[in-house]
């Protein structure tokens, strides 16, 4: 199942996922005087079987102004300044994406594309979150959101994350006015099912790492 | 639950053209691609085009491009199918699909469209 | 632009009979997809990724291929499985012409 909407936004801080579950979806989009390729794939999917999960389909696009000319190698280092890097910026990458039963890895980028990607998520994604360069997280928990169908709808778990300026004088975590869940109300009484997850080591590592910067935007 | 309901059918003239639309209900409208695939009668499904709502991103099959229009309104959570320069080899039935990654999910029921001079 | 091309045309089989239907692409693909149509109604998903059956369908129902070859089987046919079959390409969204299977 898709998950209706995005995750939470949080002020002052990106998220990304570090593998993908089977089902998600990419959309093939193109940077502006580019398109895609005519009959070319609408997106890429994650997909396999219980042993190796992979991107089906591939994204191509081409000049507007030119007609058959085709594009997907990997982009030149100028062209890659104006797309916005989907690596987290440190060597302390929290899970190793192979490894994972039912999950792709990042798609790699394609050559004039779009600098937004738009993922189309599945129930049990799970995403990290980390403030920006020049915010510090002040957590009382998990720097994640997960994806979860409750009683037939779907939602997204609030992250325990706020992001403070580095000058700004700030309360003590103790002090933290307390985030709502997107209902308003605690997650327990909300959810109806508790998923635990094997992240969760990885994610408290993911959450500290304030040098790192995630740049890409998910829609 | 998904639904997918389309307009009524049609009885148009050579050289005129046909607005389908497509309405959607039970899910969220802009986070799927739309698709419009047509069936003459007797003859095979062929795929003319879709649309991400999210964005109006569109694509469309070679053989229908330049005749065909995809567009949608998100407020009314509809998808519409315009093609004009009809003949008599456009009688058919248009469906409109709601694509799910791994496959089209969901079909409208389908709207006969008739070209008869 | 790729063509899947489907066969036979029309199939005409007995209940209980094992039954195959075959597409082939005109290049090399990753996946199939199977659709089924009954008569004055919609198309339903029935097979997706090659091999896997979407939710309700029968597992009299299975799929196999790769690369330009792809093939459903229906293992022991029954009188509800009378309908037409499309195979579907997702990544260039083209449908094969469809197989008709009539009951004897």
């Known amino acids: 199942e898709l998950c209706d909407d995005d995750p939470p936004e949080i002020p002052h801080a990106t998220f990304k996922a570090m593998a993908y579950k089977e089902g998600t979806m990419l959309n093939c989009e193109c940077k502006r005087g580019f398109r895609r390729i005519k009959s070319g794939s609408l997106y890429m999917l994650c997909t396999g079987n219980s042993s190796h999960s992979s991107w089906d389909n591939q994204c191509q696009c081409t000049s507007s102004a030119t007609r058959n000319t085709t594009k997907q190698v990997t982009p030149q280092p100028e062209e890659q300044k104006e797309r916005k890097t989907t690596e987290m910026q440190s060597p302390m990458q929290p899970v190793d994406q192979a490894s994972l039963p039912g999950h792709c890895r990042e798609p790699p980028p394609w050559e004039n594309e779009a600098t937004e990607r738009i993922y189309h998520f599945v129930v049990g994604q799970m995403v990290y979150y980390q403030c920006v360069q020049g915010y510090r997280a002040l957590h009382r928990g998990p720097a994640e959101s997960v994806c979860k169908m409750t009683h037939g709808k779907t939602r997204w778990t609030q992250p325990q994350l706020i992001c403070t300026g580095e000058m700004e004088t700030s309360q003590f975590p103790g002090e933290e006015k307390p985030q709502a869940s997107p209902e308003g109300r605690p997650e327990s009484e909300t959810s109806c099912l508790v998923t635990t997850t094997d992240f969760q080591i990885q994610t408290e590592m993911a959450a500290t790492m304030e040098t790192s910067i995630f740049t890409t935007e998910y829609q | 639950q998904v639904q997918l309901v389309q307009s009524g059918a049609e009885v148009k003239k050579p050289g005129a053209s046909v607005k389908v639309s497509c309405k959607a209900s039970?899910?969220?409208?802009?986070?799927?691609?739309m698709h419009w695939v047509r069936q003459p009668p007797g003859q095979c499904l062929e795929w003319m085009g879709a649309?991400?709502?999210?964005?109006?991103?569109?694509s469309y099959s070679q053989k229908f491009e330049g005749r065909v229009t995809i567009t949608a309104d998100t407020s009314a959570s509809t998808a519409y199918m315009e093609l004009s320069s009809l003949r008599s080899e456009d009688t058919a039935v248009y469906y409109c699909?709601?694509?799910?990654?791994?496959?089209?999910?969901?079909w409208g029921q389908g709207t006969t469209v008739t070209v008869s001079s | 632009q790729i063509v899947s091309t489907q066969s036979p045309d029309t199939q005409s089989v007995t209940p209980k009979e094992k039954v195959t239907i075959t597409c082939r692409a005109s290049s090399s693909r990753s996946y199939m997809q199977w659709y089924q149509q009954k008569p004055d109604q919609s198309p339903k998903r029935w097979i997706y990724d090659t091999s896997k059956s979407a939710s309700g369908v029968p597992s009299r129902f299975s799929g196999s291929g790769s690369g330009t070859d792809y093939t459903l089987t229906i293992n022991s046919l029954e009188a509800e499985d009378a309908a037409t079959y499309y195979c579907h390409q997702r990544s260039s969204y083209t449908f094969g012409c469809g197989t008709k299977l009539e009951i004897k």
């Open positions: 699909s709601r694509d799910y990654g791994y496959y089209f999910d969901f």
């Open positions: 039970g899910y969220s409208f802009t986070r799927y691609w």
């Open positions: 649309i991400y709502p999210g964005n109006s991103d569109t």
